[in-house]
């Protein structure tokens, strides 16, 4: 991953913080929030993007070359945006216009665009859809996707908070 211009860390921090709040509002838990289950193993997790040690999102990794981490976050945002665009969220039960889900979708797009280099090729993914006999699964899938997104965004927000605090170019005072 070549070194390229850094993002606007402060803006990313603000947007990611807002996204965390929207994801929470879109799927506020009744009771204790258990983002990641302790019994999950690697095999069951491999279809969900996670920010891991080797992604360079730790303070030292960000200092050395933040592009590795930003690429991982970009991939995760694209993955979740793709799911929010799918039949899982478009079908019944219908989501109200201007609902937290709609705002979440818009903000997710905003952060993606902020991180998306102009020349970055867009990956094409198969759009998941539910057959008529699977319609009942929709609320369960929505719940799982939003829980997973909450966990992803919580880590991404910490990355951007660290970047905003330590990697932002200081303003040079003019004489």
């Amino acid at each position: 991953v070549p070194r390229s211009s850094s993002p606007d860390w402060a803006q990313c921090q603000q947007l990611s913080r807002n996204l965390c709040m929207l994801a929470w509002n879109a799927h506020a838990p009744a009771g204790h929030m258990n983002l990641l289950r302790e019994e999950e193993d690697e095999e069951t997790k491999n279809n969900v993007p996670r920010i891991q040690c080797e992604d360079g999102c730790d303070p030292q990794g960000l200092k050395d070359n933040s592009q590795f981490c930003l690429q991982r976050i970009r991939q995760g945002l694209a993955f979740y945006k793709h799911l929010l665009d799918s039949d899982i969220f478009k079908g019944e039960p219908a989501l109200l216009p201007d609902s937290p889900m709609e705002q979440l979708h818009t903000s997710l797009l905003g952060l993606s665009q902020l991180l998306q280099p102009e020349d970055h090729p867009r990956e094409t993914q198969q759009m998941p859809s539910l057959s008529s006999s699977q319609q009942w699964q929709r609320p369960l899938l929505r719940s799982k996707i939003l829980r997973s997104l909450q966990a992803f965004l919580a880590i991404a927000a910490r990355v951007f908070a660290h970047g905003a605090a330590t990697l932002t170019e200081p303003l040079v005072p003019t004489a």
Epitope: H27, A28, P29, A30, G31, H32, N34, R37, E39, E40, T44, K45, N46, N47, V48, L83, Q137, P139, L140, L141, R142, S143, K144, I145, R147, S148
Partner: nanobody
């Protein structure tokens, strides 16, 4: 592993009510989506109702909408199915199931033994 035991079934007149319970043991079900399914004699098992892990979202088969209500008490590790205005066509063995999949898919991998509900006309 989660063990599920259904109870509350029985014989009831059309128009009557029953409340089914599904008690879980072996592990807390608070992280899992839960569902009720049923199987009538000579028919395939069919979906009745589901509830998300938090209880924040429920979904029903068209045939039971407005008559059945699914709920859960995570503190007690129990899921309920309140069945009102029962019809003869509701006669079936009712099964409780837990979605144990930790990926972004739905997989009801843990099932109870079922409880018989018979509605007479």
């Amino acid at each position: 592993e989660v063990q599920l035991v259904e109870s509350g079934g029985g014989l009831v007149q059309a128009g009557g009510s029953l409340r089914l319970s599904c008690a879980a043991s072996g592990r807390s079900i608070s992280s899992y989506a839960m569902g009720w399914f049923r199987q009538a004699p000579g028919k395939e098992r069919e979906f009745v109702a589901t509830i998300t892990w938090s209880g924040g979202s429920t979904y029903y088969a068209d045939s039971v909408k407005g008559r059945f209500t699914i709920s859960r008490d995570n503190a007690k590790n129990v899921v309920y199915l309140q069945m009102n205005n029962l019809k003869p066509e509701d006669t079936a063995v009712y099964y409780c199931a837990a979605d144990l999949s930790s990926g972004l898919d739905v997989d009801f991998g843990s099932w109870g033994q079922g409880t018989q509900v018979t509605v007479s006309s």
